[in-house]
């Protein structure tokens, strides 16, 4: 039970993670001009990875998109690089865990081949998350190597369009969204790899078989010895059916006075 | 078609108050500032300050504030300028404008004149 | 504040004759953001509110006759009117739009000669 929860737990905050790593890539306030010291202004301006905005007081704000690949700065670049690797590597690790849920039953999918998948998709969001933690921290550190130049017509602008002095930019929201959205992320990775740990089956010191006997049953007397069959007194070894043909949970694996072997 | 029709003409005495009503018409009045535009005899255009019926901010100009106080009322598509302690350089007209896109003031009222005597 | 200086204060142009007024702001106008200048011109006739003839520093307001022109950036603007009407004497003023307070200038009186 605690193995599904965890499971499904980190599945809902990987979710949220990757929604709000979405979220983060395509929002424009990445980068908000600073409006402290300075006059205030009637016209404003933020910019995101994908477009510059401007905002004026009138409540007209005029978008632009960076219509050029080889004018943007590299480091801009490796920003929309590691966001988008990590939106592919979350939605690939969304699609694996959907399967690999203990909710979720697929035709005769064996435990083993869940705690795999539930592992993958453990490892693709946690590094989903430390991607999209990087790409903000890049664009976070260019921001304040640029906030604190003083070159006269610096270039701050991520369309390629020279800045004067006046026009410093600071963090925006996107920012604050990326940094949580990775985090999450992250968190909701480190939890699919522990419920991993729990849905793998447990190794046992020896091969149990389970014989059918041929022209009677021998039932198990209740309060009495089970007639010998193998069995040692450890009932909470996983009981195999049929030669091992199934595992079931542990919870399932108590014999009842209805049981037969 | 879009229209900012104020109130009539005020006479008052030093030391009274005066509330101007700008009425707008003919677009959604919260998704426009209006903007109040100063204008004593004989002399030019003063910006006052203005106010933003969508966000509730109010932004005066640095000799207009205390007296000055700007409000609106989004039910009936009203801004107002409220002048406390009237004193007699206060006689003027008083213009409310509408900021469009490009800070632009695309509309005016028709102006209200407020004098000041005793 | 920024300060909005126009001249002359006051012109006197031939019906039909070219009109220029100045106006220089103490500060630049234009916006890197979106390489638009934060001007206008308004128009005000005696008795009458002020009408929007120009703004971004040189797009016509609609309903404006296209004798009216504006240019400048950064800090220098001029209003043209290439063909002067009887019904264009009035005062025409600037006025910047970037920096609050926003501020207008003295104002030009334009007369016919």
């Known amino acids: 039970m605690a193995v599904t929860a965890c499971q499904g737990l980190g599945f809902v905050v990987s979710l949220i993670g990757i929604a709000g790593i979405i979220a983060a890539t395509c929002m424009d306030q990445w980068s908000t001009q600073d409006l402290y010291n300075n006059p205030v202004t009637a016209v404003f301006n933020y910019q995101g990875l994908w477009r510059s905005c401007v905002r004026e007081s009138s409540g007209f704000t005029e978008c632009r998109g960076y219509f050029t690949l080889l004018g943007l700065p590299a480091m801009l670049q490796a920003v929309r690089a590691l966001m988008i690797v990590g939106i592919v590597l979350g939605a690939i690790g969304l699609l694996v865990s959907i399967f690999a849920l203990k909710c979720i039953r697929i035709g005769s999918m064996e435990d083993s081949a869940k705690a795999n998948m539930t592992l993958t998709s453990g490892i693709m969001f946690i590094v989903s998350g430390l991607c999209a933690i990087a790409g903000v921290s890049v664009f976070a550190n260019m921001l304040v190597t640029n906030f604190w130049m003083s070159t006269a017509n610096m270039y701050t602008g991520m369309g390629g369009m020279v800045q004067t002095v006046q026009t410093r930019y600071t963090f925006g929201a996107a920012l604050f969204v990326g940094w949580v959205a990775g985090g999450l992320t992250l968190i909701g990775g480190v939890m699919m790899c522990i419920a991993c740990r729990g849905l793998a089956p447990e190794e046992t010191n020896y091969k149990a078989v389970s014989y059918h006997a041929s022209g009677h049953s021998v039932a198990y007397k209740p309060g009495g010895f089970k007639a010998s069959t193998g069995f040692g007194s450890n009932t909470k070894n996983k009981k195999i059916y049929d030669g091992g043909a199934r595992t079931e949970d542990e919870v399932q694996s108590y014999p009842s006075k209805h049981d037969y072997v | 078609q879009i229209q900012l029709v104020q109130s009539g003409s005020e006479l008052k005495k030093p030391g009274a108050s005066v509330k101007v009503s700008c009425k707008a018409s003919?677009?959604?009045?919260?998704?426009?500032?209006i903007n109040w535009v100063r204008q004593a005899p004989g002399q030019g255009l003063e910006w006052m300050g203005w106010?933003?019926?969508?966000?509730?901010?109010?932004t005066y100009a640095e000799g207009f504030t205390g007296r000055f106080v700007l409000s609106w009322d989004t039910s009936v598509s009203t801004a107002y300028l409220q002048i406390s302690s009237l004193k007699a350089e206060d006689t003027a007209v008083y213009f409310c404008?509408?900021?469009?896109?490009?800070?632009?003031?695309?509309?005016w009222g028709q102006g209200t004149l407020v004098t000041v005597s005793s | 504040d920024i300060v909005m200086t126009q001249s002359p204060d006051s012109l006197a142009v031939s019906l039909g004759e070219r009109a220029t007024i100045n106006c220089k702001s103490s500060?630049?106008?234009?916006?890197?953001?979106?390489?638009?200048?934060?001007l206008a011109w308004y128009q005000q006739k005696p008795g009458q509110p002020p009408k929007l003839l120009i703004y971004w520093a040189s797009t016509r307001e609609s309903g404006v006759p296209d004798r009216f022109s504006g240019s400048g950036s950064g800090t220098d603007f001029t209003l043209t009117i290439s063909s002067l009407q009887a019904e264009d004497v009035a005062v025409y003023y600037c006025q910047q739009a970037y920096y609050y307070p926003l501020t207008f200038g003295g104002g030009t009186k334009v007369e016919i000669k």
């Open positions: 106010i933003n019926p969508n966000t509730g901010e109010t």
């Open positions: 404008a509408r900021l469009y896109y490009g800070n632009r003031f695309d509309s």
């Open positions: 500060q630049s106008l234009l916006y890197s953001g979106n390489q638009r200048n934060y």
């Open positions: 003919g677009y959604t009045f919260t998704n426009y500032g």
